[in-house]
Interface confidence: low
């Protein structure tokens, strides 16, 4: 029949060449002589000339070697045709296979490969992996089948076997433990790939392993005891700095330190912070220690790090003896700012009360009293009892030195320590009223005309507190009433001042005299400027001869 | 003698928030870490979480989200807040002090229990 | 996590007769450098809460009676009562104190046959 079984040609053949490789035949060369081609890429197209065939006797040539590598399967066609040209058969496949012949090494991908593993892992846990490729056939041939072992390590600590390699994956894992990076902290290891699966050409790479920190130390005191001074009510005040050594990688989250109080601190009068650089533990004084209450404090503080230890490991404790060194404190007034009530007006050397402080301090010191801020000069203090007195007239209505009916006075208290200390204290005095003003009307000066006037309002003020204001009245005297009429309006506090008769255009006192609801009396002169006019006037129309 | 009580609500729905206190008498309230462990009705013990002397505390992976153990001294309480709670978290409440402040005295180790309380999860 | 598990889950042993329960962790509770196993043992009655009967493996609690003992190490231990009680009959728990979070076993029912 006319067909051709795929024929196997190996690579990389010595010849001779041209070389008989099969025979193409058709049987209807019984009828007539028969011509032989062949067509297809290696044949009449490019690369042309691999193949030829004898044109009369149709054995198929191979001109030159082969490389499986570059062409690894070709595909022609066989034809036949009669003396006069005609096809006597179809167009006949022809498969050439390349069979592959070990002819290239094994190459890694990289000649170095890095990769890393936590210390201290288990035996079996995998690092990376490495690829070696070899390009010649895997799949029918072990030509290119690659098989990976591991040829050295470096260094040999804590032996010479710590890792292994997947033979065919190149998975390269932990077999033994003991990985420590505070020992070892790389491996270099020397990997081959070896081609036909162990048994053929060998080439060479490096992986290269970084043991990675974990935190398996942990943080120890050194010292583990301290002993401080603190003086008493300091805040914020550095007690001490707590050192601690850790054999981790240095400012890792394994190595960096975290200080916990776990005793000794009921009052939560301390704090502890990690200084960023050094390590450090920063133990301040959270709030003030009063010596008085507790002279020596015990502290305990345990550290661990930042990450989690990734075994079981002891904690360190560090034990710091604070003694609270003794202050001499400031006298303090009890209370800070003392109100008293007291009326207006008292006559001077009259006790107001007595305003002393408690000095903290366990010694008995001697208090002494004077008096710091005093604005108006109305008050004197005794520098031993702390009794003030009056010496100046209070008055309510003076706002200069009062608001809201509170006189405002600073007083000091001085110890005898050494050096002396002093507290101040607030004395509040609230001024209660007394009617000691009288109503007063306002504007004192008006204009009016004398046809017809205009009644004259004035406004009514009286610097007392109630009751000591209104109901206000009113009362002309020394005669003003004959031509004057006053009348107080309740409602709005205003006196309305009229014009009874005919005044002739001049300038005259009328004499007011206004009472409040306590009857304190204010006589007041109203200056009233009477001009020829008719109802309303602001001011008397020219020509005015004033006399 | 040290003595330790649960007390808090013994119903709580859905998605709400358990709120839980302890209180210790006989003893100062910040010597020793102060533990929370569940028991859900018939089943064993699930340890929540532990406050330390200093107030530091650590829990349970699988509450972390959701657990807030802390102290109010002034009271001698200790208080377990557990939120979005359902009804997986049915269980005896109990509150056990550790037996020591340090490692070396076994603080892991928990020799003072409350009596528990009884919360359950239902709408 | 560290996995306790208790053997058998239910117990049952006559007056006066030794019990025996088992405890088996998944990582070692032995820690070298203080040759400690960080582990306890708990009983448990109806209606109240765990007692403290065992610490560091064998460690008896003070109070707890002398036929209580604790024993094994790294990841198998054992609690054992040399002669049972009519007040024995509880649920005995261990628990791991040796890394976070502290985890019990699932507890063993001792009774009376």
């Known amino acids: 029949d006319w067909v051709v079984a795929p024929i196997s040609v190996p690579e990389n053949g010595k010849g001779p060449f041209p070389q008989r490789l099969n025979q193409l035949k058709s049987n209807k060369d019984r009828d007539t002589k028969i011509f032989y081609s062949i067509t297809g890429p290696g044949a009449d197209s490019p690369p042309e000339g691999v193949f030829a065939v004898e044109k009369e006797t149709g054995w198929l040539l191979l001109n030159k070697p082969l490389d499986r590598e570059e062409i690894a399967k070709y595909e022609l066609f066989g034809h036949a045709v009669s003396e006069n040209g005609a096809s006597v058969e179809d167009p006949m496949n022809i498969s050439i296979i390349v069979t592959d012949q070990n002819d290239h090494k094994p190459k890694f991908t990289q000649d170095t490969f890095r990769g890393s593993v936590l210390e201290g892992v288990l035996p079996g846990t995998s690092v990376m992996q490495v690829t070696a490729t070899d390009e010649d056939d895997a799949i029918h041939t072990y030509n290119g089948v690659v098989a990976y072992s591991i040829h050295s390590q470096e260094p040999k600590d804590p032996h010479d076997l710590m890792f292994t390699i997947h033979r065919s994956t190149g998975t390269i894992s932990v077999i033994s433990s003991g990985l420590d990076r505070e020992k070892v902290p790389e491996y270099t290891l020397t990997i081959q790939a070896t081609d036909m699966d162990g048994d053929g050409s060998t080439t060479t790479a490096v992986a290269v392993v970084e043991i990675l920190d974990a935190n398996d130390n942990a943080p120890v005191f050194d010292p583990q005891k301290y002993e401080s001074h603190v003086p008493e009510n300091a805040v914020g005040h550095e007690v001490q700095r707590l050192t601690v050594t850790d054999l981790d990688a240095p400012n890792s989250p394994a190595w960096r330190a975290t200080y916990l109080i776990v005793g000794g601190d009921d009052g939560d009068h301390f704090t502890i912070a990690t200084h960023p650089e050094s390590n450090q533990g920063i133990l301040t004084t959270r709030k003030g220690l009063d010596f008085e209450a507790k002279n020596q404090h015990t502290l305990y503080v345990e550290v661990t790090n930042e990450a989690p230890f990734v075994l079981k490991l002891p904690t360190s404790t560090a034990t710091i003896v604070v003694h609270v060194e003794d202050v001499n404190e400031a006298p303090v007034f009890v209370p800070p700012s003392k109100v008293v009530e007291v009326q207006e007006g008292i006559p001077t050397g009259e006790a107001v009360c007595v305003y002393t402080a408690k000095d903290p301090d366990k010694e008995n010191q001697k208090i002494s009293y004077r008096i710091l801020r005093d604005p108006a000069g109305w008050l004197a203090m005794d520098p031993d009892s702390g009794q003030v007195t009056v010496a100046g007239t209070l008055d309510r209505e003076d706002e200069r030195f009062v608001r809201n009916n509170i006189y405002e006075v600073m007083v000091l208290a001085v110890d005898n320590g050494s050096p002396p200390t002093t507290g101040t204290g607030t004395l509040l005095l609230t001024l209660i009223d007394v009617n000691d003003h009288g109503p007063v009307p306002e504007p004192r000066e008006i204009t009016i005309c004398n046809q017809s006037p205009e009644s004259q309002v004035l406004n009514i003020t009286d610097k007392d507190l109630s009751p000591h204001t209104s109901p206000f009245q009113a009362q002309l005297t020394d005669d003003s009433d004959i031509y004057w009429m006053a009348e107080v309006n309740e409602k709005d506090d205003t006196v309305v001042l009229s014009l009874k008769k005919f005044l002739k255009q001049d300038t005259y006192d009328v004499h007011l005299s206004l009472s409040d609801h306590g009857n304190k009396e204010q006589l007041t002169v109203i200056r009233a400027t009477v001009c020829d006019c008719h109802g309303h006037v602001e001011k008397c129309p020219d020509p005015w001869k004033g006399g | 003698q040290v003595q330790l009580q649960e007390s808090g609500p013994g119903l709580v729905k859905p998605s709400e928030t358990l709120s839980l206190t302890c209180t210790v008498s006989?003893?100062?309230?910040?010597?020793?870490?102060i533990n929370w462990i569940r028991q859900p009705p018939g089943k064993g013990l699930e340890w929540i979480g532990v406050i330390w002397t200093g107030g530091g505390t650590n829990y349970n992976p699988s509450l972390k989200s959701r657990v807030t153990i802390s102290v109010d001294t002034s009271k001698n309480q200790f208080s377990l807040k557990l939120s979005s709670v359902t009804a997986a978290d049915t269980a005896v409440y109990y509150c056990?002090?550790?037996?020591?402040?340090?490692?070396?005295?076994?603080?892991?180790?928990?020799?003072?229990w409350g009596q528990g309380t009884l919360v359950t999860v239902s709408s | 996590d560290i996995v306790m598990t208790q053997s058998p889950d239910s117990l049952a042993v006559s007056l006066g007769e030794r019990a025996t329960i088992n405890c088996k962790s998944s990582?070692?509770?032995?820690?070298?450098?203080?040759?400690?196993?960080?582990l306890a043992w708990y009983q448990q009655k109806p209606g109240q809460p765990p007692k403290l009967l065992i610490y560091w493996a064998s460690t008896r609690e003070s109070g707890v009676p002398d036929r209580f003992s604790g024993s094994g190490s790294g990841t198998d231990f054992t609690l054992t009562i040399s002669s049972l009680q009519a007040e024995d009959v509880a649920v005995y728990y261990c628990q791991q104190y040796y890394s976070y979070p502290y985890t019990f076993g699932q507890g063993t029912k001792l009774e009376i046959k």
């Open positions: 056990a002090r550790s037996r020591g402040v340090y490692d070396f005295d076994g603080r892991g180790a928990m020799d003072y």
């Open positions: 990582q070692s509770l032995l820690y070298s450098s203080n040759q400690k196993n960080y």
């Open positions: 006989g003893g100062s309230i910040t010597s020793y870490p």
